[in-house]
């Protein structure tokens, strides 16, 4: 038998909140449980769904969840079925609605001294209690001239008068919560003694020194008063005008006339109407002085024939909004055709060369007129005046390649060298007329050059080959001072190039012949065994037919190259003692010795009291410190060569003698002891 352990029970529920109808079943075999609502099976939704055997509500709905729920358990094998007790929800809710006119039938029928009934369309369960408001102020029950019926949710005004005019709203609250009217009702009951607007003043825009007129009329019974005020609350009357409104006139019908308007007259004017009863009515209107700003400049435009182009004219800022039109050759453009105006745009369709010229955009308003010209050029494809020619350019001199073209607008010329764009730098310059200048022609400038002349309409190009006429020059120029090692073999090379292979020779600078032990082999001066007499001035002469002769002068020095007689050794010194680094070099000319320590040259004039360099080249450092440690380099140099040798210096702490050590124990490394 199927037994319900837990049965659903009727319960209170809140609209839109969670709820659960419980159901638990015990049975010998498998059963399946489902729910009925008013006898119909309940389908699972996101809002309402089975949770085990129970039925869960994510948000109770007073419409969809009203009725009787029943839990049904069924054994599909035996067909046995059991039903739980019925359960239902007592759903509490409240729902906002509008304030509506119940009596009379329409607003048009509302007259002073008639009864007016308003209904509050807020509903709920349990029935809420109602509160009425006029212009946000609560209306208490039992006040004169109105009654509140909570049952009918009504507010009755008996009889209604002008004092009842206002915005009516209602709120209701119950155990569930509170709601206020979704739409309120404005009750307007005219009072003949209240001022009413007949004609309201409008904002006006006038040109300087023109006149401005504001109209203003009110009606009431008895007739209302009318007063004009300017911005600073100064009253304007025909008898008392403020100093800046000397030319103001107030007419009997309420209109205000201002003549010869000036900038100081611009501002807000208020027209105030006051009836016998009721509040004053204030109407505002602004007097603007007409103005028009300057128009932005147009950039000149370049168009190509056959295309369609548009030029937008941005109207200048102004009051009132300026009107805009285009003119060409003094004639206003039409609104259709091939060249026409569309809105603020100048449109040129299928452009022809004859369309070139000045077009003018005009803008005008009360304050005046502005105009701005735009120059329209119709581009043409460039044509040649002078193409670049194959040229022979001299090395080292400026070279020129022409690229003279004409077009509208002035064409842009770019040059390419070996298909690479030439960017202007210290060597290349492109003149305004398109000519390329190579400032100092190099041998490798001998190649193809191409110039391209362009306008927006198209481009033309031509190329030319440059042949460089190589100058007669030494390659490389011989060093003007050279050293040869005494008693050794030596060679002094000299080579040159030119348009034609030059012939090269050496001679003594005085023009005398070379001694027979010195040979000149196609420009290489060869000394089999250098003697002291070989020192002196020599001239290398390179010569060819087309270019003549060039000379390079060389001073040869005979030297005994540097060797070290004494080199510094690896040295370890106790802190506070003196270090001696010896260095002696020989050579001719006699070498000078410099020392480098810790990667900087030791300047003998700035050594300080602890360091000294002896005439023989040795370096002495007194009172050595740990920071003196490092590599020391002895550099020997003369006008012919330079040699260096280095050794490390270590500065160590003096060990504290142990008892067992005798006074004569030697240190564990080579020391300088002072």
């Amino acid at each position: 038998a199927i037994v319900f352990i837990k049965q659903p029970s009727s319960q209170d529920a809140l609209q839109g909140r969670r709820a659960l109808l419980r159901c638990e079943v015990e049975a010998p075999g498998p059963v399946h449980v489902y729910w009925l609502l008013d006898g119909a099976p309940v389908q699972d939704t996101e809002r309402r769904f089975a949770q085990g055997s129970s039925l869960s509500f994510a948000a109770v709905d007073r419409l969809q969840d009203s009725g009787t729920f029943q839990c049904v358990a069924r054994d599909d094998v035996t067909g046995e079925e059991a039903r739980s007790a019925n359960a239902s929800f007592n759903i509490k809710w409240i729902e906002a609605g509008p304030v509506v006119l119940k009596h009379p039938a329409s607003e048009a029928e509302i007259q002073p001294q008639t009864q007016v009934t308003l209904r509050c369309h807020i509903d709920g369960h349990p029935r809420p209690t109602y509160q009425w408001f006029r212009d946000g102020t609560p209306l208490s029950d039992g006040q004169s001239n109105h009654t509140v019926s909570s049952k009918e949710r009504n507010l009755t005004l008996r009889p209604a008068g002008p004092e009842h005019s206002g915005l009516y709203s209602c709120c209701a609250h119950s155990a569930f919560g509170q709601a206020c009217s979704s739409q309120n009702f404005t009750l307007s009951i005219a009072d003949e003694s209240f001022a009413r607007v007949v004609l309201a003043p409008q904002d006006v825009v006038v040109a300087r020194y023109e006149e401005a007129m504001f109209h203003c009329q009110f009606s009431a019974q008895p007739p209302p008063s009318l007063q004009w005020l300017f911005e600073d609350e100064t009253p304007i009357t025909n008898r008392s005008r403020p100093p800046h409104l000397r030319r103001a006139t107030v007419f009997a019908n309420g209109s205000l006339l201002l003549t010869q308007v000036r900038p100081r007259n611009a501002g807000i004017y208020r027209c105030i109407g006051q009836g016998q009863r009721g509040p004053p009515i204030i109407l505002e209107a602004t007097l603007h002085l007409a103005e028009i700003e300057d128009m932005p400049l147009f950039e000149p435009r370049v168009f190509t024939a056959g295309s369609e182009e548009r030029v937008t004219c941005l109207p200048p800022k102004g009051l009132p909004e300026p009107s805009v039109w285009w003119e060409h050759a003094g004639v206003r453009l039409p609104t259709h055709g091939r060249v026409y105006q569309k809105g603020h745009e100048l449109v040129l369709a299928n452009i022809a060369e004859s369309d070139a010229g000045v077009y003018t955009c005009h803008a005008a308003n009360l304050a005046g007129q502005r105009r701005q010209d735009v120059n329209i050029t119709v581009a043409t494809v460039p044509s040649w005046l002078k193409k670049p020619q194959d040229s022979q350019l001299e090395e080292g001199k400026p070279g020129y390649l022409d690229c003279l073209t004409q077009a509208t607008p002035k064409p842009t010329v770019v040059w390419y060298r070996n298909q690479m764009l030439i960017s202007e730098d210290s060597r290349f310059e492109v003149f305004k007329n398109g000519t390329l200048r190579i400032n100092s022609v190099e041998v490798y400038d001998g190649t193809w050059y191409r110039c391209m002349s362009s306008t927006p309409a198209g481009s033309i190009e031509a190329q030319a080959r440059v042949q460089v006429l190589e100058k007669l020059k030494f390659t490389p120029p011989p060093q003007p001072q050279q050293c040869m090692e005494f008693d050794k073999e030596a060679t002094v090379p000299c080579s040159a190039t030119g348009r034609e292979k030059p012939t090269i020779k050496w001679e003594r600078a005085d023009g005398s012949s070379l001694p027979e032990w010195v040979t000149d082999n196609a420009g290489t001066l060869h000394f089999a065994r250098v003697t002291r007499d070989d020192a002196g001035n020599y001239t290398c002469i390179a010569s060819n037919g087309p270019q003549g002769q060039i000379r390079a002068h060389v001073q040869l020095t005979v030297a005994v190259f540097i060797t070290f007689k004494v080199e510094p050794e690896r040295t370890t010194v106790y802190q506070g003692h003196t270090a001696l680094l010896q260095c002696e070099a020989q050579g001719d000319p006699k070498p000078l010795i410099q020392w480098k320590g810790k990667d900087r040259i030791l300047d003998p004039t700035k050594l300080g009291p602890r360091m000294h360099i002896f005439q023989n080249g040795s370096l002495v450092i007194h009172d050595v410190a740990p920071e003196d440690s490092g590599r020391y380099t002895c550099i020997a140099g003369n006008s012919c060569n330079i040699k260096h040798t280095e050794a490390p210096l270590y500065v160590v702490d003096k060990p504290v003698p142990e008892e067992s050590e005798g006074p004569g124990s030697p240190p564990p490394y080579k020391m300088i002891q002072t």
Epitope: L472, T503, I504, K505, E507, A509, D510, G511, S512, S513, L514, E516, T519, D520, A522, T539, S543, N544, G545, Q547, G548, Q549, I550, R551
Partner: antibody, heavy 114, light 107 residues
């Protein structure tokens, strides 16, 4: 067209001086070493003196050293030969030329005779 | 001084014949040798410079060569207008020296 035009020749007594000039045109004068070469009547050619393109180095044959002076003015493109202590053996046609790649003048006759 | 020994002193050759004139330098002069042609009553004219380079306007039948310190001028097909005296000049070392000349005649 290259042109070298000598002037200043003529008859001169032994021991006296004479100056020859050579006006150059049609080429870059300052690029070339210049020389004077002479030819005694019915004899061969004899180099006399030369000067480097910038004028800094001069060369003379031993027989004229100390008597003749070669000079040039690159701005005016002229070559000069100042001859002193003239001897009868200096009698010859004197040619101005670009040394090495010779363009020659038409020559000017110098006669040293008492 | 460098001596230039020119040979032969004179020679007669037939038209269209090959003619060779030599100059022997007393020491190495590299390629600093030129050849000149002089016609009676005229200034000498440059034929070849730098041992082998033909001067502008000189017919290609003229050529120059060198073997050590011996230099040669060759006329491949003798023409009537080639008669005259031919000189070599060494411009390697001052004093610059001319050869003694070779007088060329037509047979």
């Amino acid at each position: 067209e290259v042109q070298l035009v000598e002037s200043g020749g003529g008859l001169v007594q032994p021991g006296r001086s004479m100056k020859l000039s050579c006006a150059a045109s049609g080429f870059t004068f300052s690029n070339y070493d210049m020389a004077w070469v002479r030819q005694a009547p019915t004899k061969g050619l004899e180099w006399v003196t030369s000067v480097s393109s910038d004028g800094s180095t001069t060369y003379y044959r031993d027989s004229v050293k100390g008597r003749f002076t070669i000079s040039r003015d690159n701005a005016k493109t002229t070559l000069s030969l100042q001859m002193g202590s003239l001897r009868s053996e200096d009698t010859a046609t004197y040619y101005c030329l670009t040394l090495y790649y010779s363009h020659w003048g038409q020559g000017v006759m110098v006669t040293v005779s008492s | 001084d460098i001596q230039m020994t020119q040979s032969p002193a004179s020679l007669s050759a037939s038209l269209e014949e090959i003619v060779t004139i030599t100059c022997q330098a007393s020491q190495d002069i590299g390629d600093w040798l030129s050849w000149y042609q002089q016609k009676p009553g005229k200034s000498p004219q440059l034929l070849i410079y730098g041992t082998t380079t033909l001067a502008d306007g000189v017919p290609s039948r003229f050529s120059g060569s060198r073997s050590g310190t011996q230099f040669s001028l060759k006329i491949s097909r003798l023409q009537v207008e080639d008669i005259g005296i031919y000189y070599c000049l060494q411009a390697y070392s001052a004093p610059f020296t001319f050869g003694s000349g070779t007088k060329l005649k037509i047979k």
